[in-house]
């Protein structure tokens, strides 16, 4: 499907508006520190060039690859070395090494100021004054903070962002209309970013085979009526889409995603009965809807799995002839029968099955050797079931905030070397599994909980990779993608950790805490809790609870005081002394 000019091809396929938006996202994800105006200038230059290629595909440079064109453009940025340091060395390389170099310098935790939401009237004025710039700025700010955000999905978020302002800036109570919508977009956006980050980590750290296995399991759960060949085709196409997006090939990714949505909708009769509504929507909504569509009903009277995968005399022959296809069939058949299992559990079962066949098919009596393979699955299934049961009970007993605190303590004791902000962020997100999943019936709890935990633990893994401080984190993150959660669950208190020196400054609070939102106040308290555990890793739950209760009372008291700052200074000293005594510091 060769085109004389790739840039012209993508411009024509995507249209000018999407082309410009995707180039802006691509540039902001690569050069995360560059000012907005510089990016807009680069995007306009690329767009004008693309238009010349649409007019004449044989024009000069129109035959160059997108990586060459975009890389050349990024390398014209004057302040590259001052702003990005060694990333500037990428520009001395040729493609494809130059693009790989840019990818390696993407920063999951860029040193950027927190996005502060202006007053509603200020936002509405900015929106009305220059809608185009306002929306571009949204794309830019999200993309630079989330360098792996799924670009075609970000276009969908931007469309909803625009719709929110269009509707609410005309409303009688603008704030009441707009703020909940913006909160929802922010929360959904963070979740979407984290889910995509796991897909990219899966592809980049564990390879295409790992991603395809994940996709076979998930699509088989979602489309249990589809034939294996159909699922395989969807997996191949989906893998191409995500490989492109994770590799920075955003134009190709968006174009291929649109083609995939078109194919799914044209073939919904052989895929799923749940796609009808999705397929009536416009492109961006359609693709989003398909990605989130509920599982179809399982076909009635599916035969036992044992017939083809244990009892058949052809198991080893079939496995030897096409190992990955046979394992793919196993995964497909198991997953379509088990929407109640997490994808990672299904992958663990497939791995166990593979390991058994590798061993048994080379044995003297293969069938005798693998006859009981399904019995090996039982403990693998029970482990997450029990863990979820215990943690949902704890969540229901404590509520979200205190459940997060329990996880903060648990994880700080496991990996105390990890930075406090990372421990707070990750543990807070781990704690959200309770309100997200524990409300579900048994049949939906495990896929909700364990697959969500995989996303959150991947955040820990990518943040830790930037500044590795714990061999235990590195080990759990790199050994096996599907066993990350069991690996972290199995970690006990790190006995090798030397407690942090006590620093009173860490526990000094000021009146500004009183004006913070409830969420920000929780984060302050949780930060203090992590620091406490780092000082006293052997502190008991009761000791920590007592100190935290005292701390909460102290904040409440001083925030009610007339002279807040004095209260924080004097009462704070007393609290620190009492805490030290209580914990034996």
């Amino acid at each position: 499907d060769a085109h004389k000019s790739e840039v012209a091809h993508r411009f024509k396929d995507l249209g000018e508006e999407n082309f410009k938006a995707l180039v802006l996202i691509a540039f902001a994800q690569y050069l995360q520190q560059c000012p907005f105006e510089d990016h807009v200038k680069l995007v306009n230059e690329v767009t004008e060039f693309a238009k010349t290629c649409v007019a004449d595909e044989s024009a000069e440079n129109c035959d160059k690859s997108l990586h060459t064109l975009f890389g050349d453009k990024l390398c014209t940025v004057a302040t590259l070395r001052e702003t990005y340091g060694e990333m500037a060395d990428c520009c001395a390389k040729q493609e494809p090494e130059r693009n790989e170099c840019f990818l390696q310098h993407k920063d999951d935790n860029p040193n950027l100021p927190r996005l502060v939401r202006p007053e509603v009237d200020v936002m509405c004025t900015a929106f009305h004054d220059n809608e185009e710039t306002f929306l571009k700025k949204y794309l830019y700010e999200i993309a630079r903070r989330h360098p792996y955000f799924y670009a075609p999905e970000l276009l969908f978020f931007a469309k909803r962002y625009k719709a929110a302002f269009t509707e609410c800036c005309q409303a009688a109570d603008k704030a009441a209309c707009l703020l909940p919508k913006l909160d929802e977009l922010r929360d959904e956006g963070k979740a979407s970013s984290a889910k995509q980050r796991l897909k990219c980590a899966s592809l980049q750290k564990f390879g295409e085979r790992a991603f395809k296995a994940w996709a076979v399991a998930r699509l088989s759960q979602r489309f249990p009526k589809a034939e294996f060949a159909e699922v395989s085709k969807l997996v191949t196409d989906l893998t191409k889409v995500h490989t492109e997006c994770c590799h920075g090939d955003l134009l190709e990714c968006a174009d291929d995603r649109a083609d995939l949505a078109k194919y799914i909708c044209e073939n919904q009769d052989s895929i799923s009965s749940k796609l009808k509504e999705c397929c009536e929507k416009p492109l961006l909504e359609k693709s989003h809807c398909i990605a989130e569509v509920e599982n179809d009903e399982m076909p009635a009277d599916l035969p036992s799995l044992a017939a083809d995968f244990v009892e058949s005399k052809d198991v080893c022959k079939n496995y030897a002839e096409a190992k990955d296809v046979f394992l793919g069939m196993f995964l497909y058949e198991y997953a379509r029968r088990h929407p109640d299992y997490s994808v990672v559990l299904l992958l663990r079962l497939a791995k166990t099955y593979e390991t058994t066949l590798e061993k048994c098919c080379a044995a003297a009596d293969p069938h005798e050797c693998y006859a009981k393979v399904f019995d090996e699955f039982k403990p693998l299934v029970e482990e997450p079931q029990n863990l979820i049961k215990q943690n949902c009970e704890l969540f229901e007993q404590l509520g979200e905030y205190k459940f997060q605190n329990a996880l903060l303590v648990r994880y700080t004791k496991k990996v105390p070397q990890v930075s406090t902000p990372t421990l707070v962020e990750v543990s807070r997100n781990l704690g959200k599994v309770g309100s997200k999943c524990c409300k579900h019936p048994e049949a939906k709890r495990m896929p909700c909980a364990e697959d969500y935990l995989s996303v959150v633990l991947n955040q820990l893994c990518v943040l830790h990779e930037k500044t590795p401080v714990s061999d235990r984190v590195t080990k759990c993150c790199t050994e096996s993608l599907v066993n990350r959660r069991p690996c972290f669950s199995a970690l006990e208190v790190d006995e090798t950790y030397v407690p942090k020196e006590f620093n009173a400054e860490t526990f000094t609070f000021h009146a500004d805490i009183c004006t913070l939102s409830e969420k920000e106040r929780q984060i302050k308290k949780q930060t203090a809790l992590v620091e406490l555990v780092k000082h006293k890793p052997k502190a008991t739950k009761e000791q920590l609870k007592a100190v935290m209760d005292d701390f909460a009372a102290f904040v409440e008291k001083c925030c009610k005081a007339d002279d807040k700052e004095t209260c924080f200074a004097e009462e704070g000293k007393k609290l620190v002394a009492a805490s030290q005594a209580a914990l034996g510091l």
């Epitope: 080893c316 079939n318 030897a320 002839e321 096409a322 296809v325 098919c361 080379a362």
Partner: nanobody, 123 residues
């Protein structure tokens, strides 16, 4: 493009031996399982033997077990079939084959196959 070229066939007396070879190209041989199938005059395709990508797993049809040995050399992109104690009923065209994406496992008509090499066993 996938190419499989068989050689080593010929005429042999009952109880004799032959070694068939199959040179492969156009695909990643070292990650592909390989198969020998045969077609006797006027009959359909019959599976003979399979060897896994790393040669750890070998499987044989009951009719050839103990007489035939499949092997491979990944450095040479070649698969072999050592045939001993040959019988009249082993007379057939022998094909080397490998799985073709999208086909059903064991549906040898749909696999990539070579042009075959004729083995004739007669007194």
């Amino acid at each position: 493009e996938v190419q499989l070229v068989e050689s080593g066939g010929g005429e042999v007396q009952p109880g004799g031996s032959l070694r068939l070879s199959c040179a492969a190209s156009g695909f990643t041989f070292s990650t592909s399982g390989m198969v020998w199938v045969r077609q006797a005059p006027g009959k359909g395709l019959e599976w003979v033997s399979t060897i896994s990508d790393d040669a750890r797993i070998t499987v044989y049809a009951e009719s050839v077990k103990g007489r035939f040995t499949i092997s491979r050399d990944n450095a040479k992109n070649t698969v072999y079939l050592q045939m001993n104690s040959l019988r009249a009923e082993d007379t057939a065209v022998y094909y080397c084959a490998t799985y073709r994406a999208g086909s059903r496992i064991g549906s040898y008509e749909d696999y990539y196959r070579g042009q075959g090499t004729l083995v004739t066993v007669r007194p």
